[in-house]
C-alpha cells in the first residue's frame, strides 16, 4: 500500500496506526511534539520499507529506538529534503539508538543527528555505506561517545559477530544497537545490493531485494518502478511521479488536490507527472496536461476584490509577487520604510499591465518609479474623477519616473495629472508624455510648472570626466571644474560609486527617501584653487570588479524663485585592476599508482582576475620512522596517528589546571588560544545551527487553521 | 486531528435517490481531498468517489459514473454524495475518507475515516 502525500504524526501516538498498512510513504515522514512519554513497544510497522522524502524525528518523548517501530525501512530517497537533509533526529530525550537496522540507502541528502541528550551508537554506524557523501552530515550536542560505552553484538563474548570498516581512521566494528549488526554486502556486488545471504541483488535493486539478480524482487528501486518491476527508465507512455515510479497519463489526470491549483489538475512535463508547470513555462490552454515555454516571464494575473489595491507597506506589495498582469487599480501611498525601494521592485517589478489607473500620492519615501521596472502598458479602463489613469499628488522626494531611455509605456486611455511633486522636474513630465502618448490629451492645469520641481536643479548641465587611474584596489577619478552663473551657487561635489557587473545601472536604483542607497557616496569640497580640477580617490575596493561611477555637483536649488542649473556627469565603468588571487580550496592528493600523484583542488573563491594556470610544487620528504615502529602482523590494534584539532577537551582542561612550557621536561600543556580563523568557525557554526533551527520551528509550528 | 460523521444512510427502493452527508469537524476544511468508499458484506472496500480542495475536480468509480455525485460545502465543512438509480449491488456501509493536500487513484490509506452509515437498496 502506498500512503502520502507525507504523513505527520504529531501531538497524540495513537496516530500512528495511520501507518499500520503503508509499505511506501509517497512523501516524508514526520513524527513529533509528543510530549507524553508513552510505551512504543505494541507499535511496530513491519511493512514500511520505503520513504521517497524524509523522515523527521523531533520532541518524541518516551520514543528510545526505532528499530522497533521501522524494523524493515530500508530507503529514504530524499526526493524533497528538510533542508538539505533526508533524516533529521532533533531533541529526541529518550532516544537511546536509532536502530534502523535494515537501513540501507538514502538516495539524496544528508542526516542531521543533533540535541538528543541520550543518544548513543553513533560513532558504530559507517554513513558512508548508506550516503554517497557524509561530508554534509551533521552530528552534534548528542550523548558524549565517553559516555556511551557502545558495544557491538558478541563484542562482549570476544566472538564479535559485525564486520569492520575505518572511519577517520579508526577501524572498527559495525553496529546500529547492542544486538544488530550493520549489514554490508560483499565486495563482489559492489555499489548493488545482496540479499539476507549475501547474493547479489538486480542492478536496478536499491537497498536489498528477497531473491538474487532479479529485478521484481527488489526492496526498492534505483530508478524507477513499474508493474512490478525495477526499470532503468519509465516505458513509453509512462511518466516519471514523486522521483520513483512510472504512472500512465490517465493516473496523471486523475489526481486530485487540495491545494489552490487544483481547478486545473496535474501535468505532464518532461516526460514527469507534476502538480504545475516548472518556471518559465505555462499550461498550453486551461485544460490542458502538457506546458509550453513562456515568451518572457510567465504570466500572473491577480485581482483586487476591492477593484483598486493599495501600496501603503513591503506587506501589502508583497502579494503582488510575480503578477505580471494586475487587473484593477494601483493606489501607491508609501509614506515611509526600510529599503523600500528594492523591496517594492522585488514583489512589483514583474508587473507589466495595469488594467485600471495608477495613483501615486503622498509617498514621501520614493525617490523614483523605477521600482515598477517592467510596466509597460495602463489600460485606463477605469479611470479617476476628471478621467485621469496616472494621477502623481504631493510626493515630496519624487525626482525620476522612469529611465525613459530604456523604457516603452504606453497609457492607452485617459489623462495623466501631476501636482506638489516639488523635486520632479517638469521636462520630466513632459517626457512622459511624449513616451506614453498622452501628448495633447492634458489640459493646461493637469501639469502644473509652478509646483512640479520647484526645488530641484533641473537643467542639468553635464560634468565630463577629465581622468581615470586605477590600481588593484583604488580608482582615482577628476572632472571638468563646474562653473554655474554664479559661482557662489556650487557648494561641493558628491561622488557615487558602485559595484556593477553589467553596464546597466540608473542613478535611481535601490535608491529611497528614507536613507536606502545602493550608492556609495562621498563627498568632494571644491578645490581652493580654481585652476585645479576636482577629483578624488576611491579606496578599499575589490580587485578587477567593475564599478559604476557618476559625479552630482551640489548647488543652491533656488535663487528668488528663478530655477538654476545643476550638473552631474553620465555614469562611467571602470574595472580595478587584477591581483593575486586567493588560495586554491580543497586539495586533495592520492597515491593511484607506486608512481604517480593525483592532486585535484577547487578554484580559489576570490580569484581578482582572470585565472590563465596554476603552479603546482611537490617534494620529497622523509619517510617516517613511526610507521616502522609497530608489528603489523600483531592483532592489537593498529595505533592511530592523532592531530591536534586545535579544539579543547573541557575535561581535559579542568584535570591539567597548571601552565607549563612545553619541551625539556615533558609536562602537561595549555591548549593554544583559538586562531581568528577557529573563532570565525565557531561563529558560523553557531550562526548555522541557530538557522536550522529557526527553520524546523518555522515548518512545525504552524498557526492553527481557522 | 478531523473528525469525520456520516448520516443520510437507510434503506431505499431500487431505482430510488438518496443524499449521504459527512460532517467534517476540525482544521481546514478546503485543506483535504474527500471521498466515498464502501464495503458490502463479506466484501472488501471500494472506493466510490473523490473530490479536490476546492469541489471543481471530481473522480468516480465505474460502477457508479453517471449515478452518483459528489459535491462539497467547504462553507459549511460538509460534504455530499448524491446517489441516483440506486441498485441492489449498491447495498453497503458507506465511509467517509479524507486525506491532507492530495489523493491519487490508488490512494486507499486515507489518513481520516469516519465511522460509516448503512445504505440498504431493496424492493
Known amino acids: 500500500e502506498i500512503c502520502g502525500p507525507g504523513i505527520d504524526i504529531r501531538n497524540d501516538y495513537q496516530q500512528l496506526k495511520r501507518l499500520e498498512n503503508c509499505t511506501v510513504i509517497e512523501g516524508y515522514l514526520h513524527i513529533l511534539l509528543i510530549s507524553k512519554a508513552e510505551d512504543y513497544r505494541s507499535y511496530r510497522f513491519p511493512k514500511l520499507t520505503v520513504i521517497t522524502e524524509y523522515l523527521l524525528l523531533f520532541r518524541v518523548a518516551g520514543l528510545e529506538s526505532l528499530g522497533d517501530l521501522f524494523p524493515n525501512l530500508t530507503v529514504i530517497r530524499g526526493w524533497k529534503l528538510f533542508y538539505n537533509y533526508a533524516l533529521v533526529i532533533f531533541e529526541m530525550t529518550n532516544l537511546k539508538d536509532i536502530g534502523l537496522y535494515n537501513l540501507r540507502n538514502i538516495t539524496r541528502g544528508a542526516i542531521r543527528i543533533e540535541k538528543n541528550a541520550d543518544l548513543c551508537y553513533l560513532s558504530t554506524v559507517d554513513w558512508s555505506l548508506i550516503l554517497d557523501a557524509v561530508s554534509n552530515n551533521y552530528i552534534v550536542g548528542n550523548k558524549p561517545p565517553k559516555e556511551c560505552g557502545d558495544l557491538c553484538p558478541g563484542t562482549m563474548e570476544e566472538k564479535p559477530m559485525c564486520e569492520k570498516t575505518t572511519i577517520n581512521n579508526e577501524y572498527n566494528y559495525r553496529c546500529w544497537t547492542t544486538n544488530r549488526c550493520q549489514k554490508m554486502c560483499p565486495s563482489t556486488c559492489g555499489k548493488r545490493a545482496c540479499t539476507e545471504n549475501n547474493e547479489c541483488c538486480h542492478p536496478e535493486c536499491l537497498g536489498s531485494c528477497s531473491a538474487p539478480d532479479n529485478d521484481t524482487a527488489c526492496v526498492a528501486c534505483r530508478h524507477y518502478y513499474y508493474a512490478g518491476v525495477c526499470v532503468p527508465a519509465c516505458p513509453p507512455n509512462t511518466y516519471r511521479f514523486e522521483g520513483w515510479r512510472c504512472v500512465d497519463r490517465d493516473f496523471c489526470a486523475n489526481i486530485l488536490s487540495a491545494e489552490s491549483s487544483d481547478s486545473e489538475g496535474f501535468v505532464i512535463h518532461d516526460g514527469e507527472c507534476m502538480q504545475e508547470c516548472p518556471s518559465g513555462f505555462i499550461r498550453n490552454g486551461s485544460q490542458s496536461m502538457y506546458c509550453i515555454p513562456c515568451e518572457g516571464p510567465c504570466p500572473k494575473v491577480c485581482e483586487e476584490e476591492k477593484k483598486t489595491k493599495t501600496i501603503d507597506s513591503v506587506t501589502s506589495a508583497q502579494m503582488l509577487q510575480g503578477c505580471t498582469i494586475f487587473k484593477g487599480n494601483l493606489l501607491i501611498n508609501i509614506r515611509r520604510g526600510n529599503n523600500i525601494a528594492s523591496e517594492l521592485e522585488n514583489f512589483m517589478g514583474l508587473i507589466e499591465v495595469v488594467t485600471g489607473y495608477v495613483k501615486i500620492r503622498h509617498s514621501h519615501a520614493l525617490v523614483s518609479l523605477s521600482f515598477l521596472k517592467n510596466l509597460r502598458l495602463i489600460l485606463g479602463e477605469e479611470q479617476l474623477e476628471g478621467n485621469y489613469s496616472f494621477y502623481v499628488l504631493d510626493n515630496q522626494n519624487l525626482q525620476q519616473l522612469w529611465d525613459w531611455d530604456h523604457r516603452n509605456l504606453t497609457i492607452k486611455a485617459g489623462k495623466m495629472y501631476f501636482a506638489f511633486n516639488p523635486k520632479l522636474c517638469v521636462s520630466e513630465i513632459y517626457r512622459m508624455e511624449e513616451v506614453t502618448g498622452t501628448k495633447g490629451r492634458q489640459s493646461k492645469g493637469d501639469i502644473n510648472t509652478r509646483n512640479n520641481g520647484e526645488r530641484a536643479s533641473c537643467e542639468s548641465d553635464v560634468l565630463h570626466f577629465t581622468s581615470t587611474t586605477t590600481s588593484k584596489n583604488r580608482i582615482i577619478i577628476t572632472w571638468h571644474r563646474y562653473r554655474p552663473p554664479d559661482y557662489r551657487d556650487l557648494i561641493s561635489f558628491t561622488v557615487y560609486y558602485k559595484e556593477a557587473p553589467f553596464k546597466n545601472v540608473t542613478e535611481y536604483d535601490g535608491q529611497d527617501a528614507c536613507g536606502s542607497n545602493s550608492w556609495n557616496m562621498v563627498d568632494v569640497d571644491l578645490p581652493p584653487n580654481k585652476d585645479v580640477e576636482p577629483g578624488i580617490l576611491l579606496h578599499g575596493l575589490k580587485p578587477w570588479t567593475q564599478y559604476a561611477v557618476y559625479v552630482k555637483a551640489v548647488t543652491l536649488t533656488m535663487v528668488e524663485n528663478d530655477h538654476i542649473r545643476g550638473a552631474k556627469s553620465e555614469i562611467l565603468y571602470i574595472r580595478t585592476n587584477a591581483s593575486v588571487p586567493s588560495i586554491p580550496l580543497d586539495v586533495l592528493s592520492a597515491s593511484n599508482s607506486s608512481s604517480q600523484l593525483i592532486v585535484k583542488w577547487n578554484p580559489p573563491s576570490l580569484p581578482n582576475g582572470n585565472l590563465s594556470y596554476y603552479i603546482v610544487r611537490w617534494q620529497r620528504q622523509p619517510q617516517d620512522g613511526y610507521l616502522y615502529r609497530h608489528n603489523y602482523c600483531s592483532k592489537d590494534k593498529i595505533p592511530i596517528r592523532k592531530y591536534a584539532d586545535g579544539t579543547i577537551d573541557i575535561e581535559e582542561v579542568t584535570e591539567n589546571p597548571k601552565t607549563e612550557v612545553c619541551g625539556g621536561e615533558k609536562g602537561p600543556c595549555c591548549a593554544c588560544p583559538k586562531t581568528e580563523a577557529e573563532k570565525q568557525a565557531e561563529k558560523e557554526e553557531a550562526e548555522y545551527r541557530k538557522v536550522f533551527e529557526n527553520f524546523l520551528h518555522n515548518s512545525i509550528f504552524v498557526p492553527r487553521p481557522e | 486531528e478531523v473528525q469525520l460523521v456520516e448520516s443520510g444512510g437507510g434503506l431505499v427502493q431500487p431505482g430510488g435517490s438518496l443524499r449521504l452527508s459527512c460532517a467534517a469537524s476540525g482544521p481546514a476544511f478546503s485543506s483535504f481531498v474527500m471521498a466515498w468508499f464502501r464495503q458490502a458484506p463479506g466484501k472488501g472496500l471500494e472506493f466510490v468517489s473523490a473530490i479536490s480542495g476546492s469541489g471543481s475536480r471530481a473522480r468516480y468509480a465505474d460502477s457508479v459514473k453517471g449515478r452518483f455525485t459528489i459535491s462539497r460545502d467547504n462553507s459549511k465543512n460538509t460534504l455530499y454524495l448524491q446517489m441516483n438509480s440506486l441498485r441492489a449491488e449498491d447495498t453497503a456501509v458507506y465511509y467517509c475518507?479524507?486525506?491532507?493536500?492530495?489523493?491519487?487513484?490508488?490512494?486507499?490509506?486515507?489518513?481520516?475515516w469516519g465511522q460509516g452509515t448503512l445504505v440498504t437498496v431493496s424492493s
Open positions: 475518507a479524507a486525506n491532507p493536500r492530495r489523493a491519487t487513484p490508488d490512494l486507499t490509506q486515507y489518513a481520516y
